[in-house]
Interface confidence: low
């Protein structure tokens, strides 16, 4: 039986496949209709995108050879589909911070202001995220200095 | 150019200790935070001991205690004093500094614990 906490994540499940396999969801009169399967701009303050824009940094920061944490300096645009989860398009700007990877990784650390120690990357992530199972993937990340 | 050149691995015991050293070239050393990262065989490279310029030190939870990093400025060196050395500690080790924006790696000393 689904508890308290699943029943509702299971509801939102089935909405998102339905979602996803209407042809003309979220259509207007005298508008085409718009594939809800397609990429949508979304906000930086949603829930998912913080999560996502979390998990995608804590990535890059495991695969950096970088002494030094790096956090997101900006969001330039998040975008999301609705698929068979939902998968999460960050572009980001991100900066080295002050905490060295020897420390936990601190959401207020500071930034590098020495110019031979500034650095900044700039990061196009897709994360493909399943709600209801709390999972996610970061199924491509390209970046370069910026 | 920025140069590194560690040196002083080797096979050594369970509990035995090694001293490693990276001599450093093309930079202003002093100035400089330098730290050593590991590769372990089939695993990530991974930070071992950082020092700052002014001279904090920071360790890997798997190293506290047991390993020490030091700088000498005026010999324009970096060493990892390794004591209690243990199996889990074999790997490639690297010394590694940044400057402008880049990161500049040594070609890395052998550390067999066995």
């Known amino acids: 039986m689904a508890g308290p906490l699943r029943a509702p994540l299971l509801l939102l499940a089935i909405l998102a496949v339905a979602l996803a396999v209407s042809p003309a969801a979220g259509s207007s009169p005298g508008k085409p209709p718009r594939l809800v399967g397609g990429p949508m701009d979304a906000s930086v303050e949603e829930e998912g995108v913080r999560r996502a824009l979390d998990f995608a940094v804590g990535e890059y920061n495991k695969a950096s050879n970088d002494m030094y944490h790096s956090r997101a300096l900006q969001v330039v645009r998040a975008r999301k589909q609705i698929v068979a989860g939902v998968n999460y398009f960050l572009d980001v700007e991100l900066g080295r911070t002050t905490c060295t990877k020897t420390q936990p990784n601190l959401d207020n650390c500071p930034f590098h202001d020495q110019p031979h120690l500034k650095r900044k990357a700039f990061c196009s992530f897709q994360i493909y995220a399943v709600p209801w199972q709390g999972t996610m993937t970061l199924s491509k990340s390209t970046c370069q200095d910026a | 150019d920025v140069q590194l050149q560690a040196s002083g691995g080797g096979l050594v015991q369970p509990g035995g200790s090694l001293r490693l050293s990276c001599a450093v070239s093309?930079?202003?050393?002093?100035?400089?935070?330098m730290a050593w990262y590991r590769q372990p065989p089939e695993k990530r490279r991974e930070l071992v001991a950082l020092?700052?310029?002014?001279?904090?030190?920071s360790y890997a939870d798997s190293v506290k205690d047991r390993f020490t990093i030091s700088r000498d400025n005026i010999q324009r060196t970096l060493y990892l004093q390794m004591n209690s050395l243990k199996p889990e500690d074999t790997a490639v080790y690297y010394c590694?500094?940044?400057?402008?924006?880049?990161?500049?790696w040594g070609k890395g000393t052998h550390v067999t614990v066995s």
């Open positions: 020092i700052t310029g002014g001279g904090n030190t």
């Open positions: 590694t500094t940044q400057r402008s924006g880049r990161q500049y």
């Open positions: 093309g930079t202003n050393f002093r100035l400089n935070d």
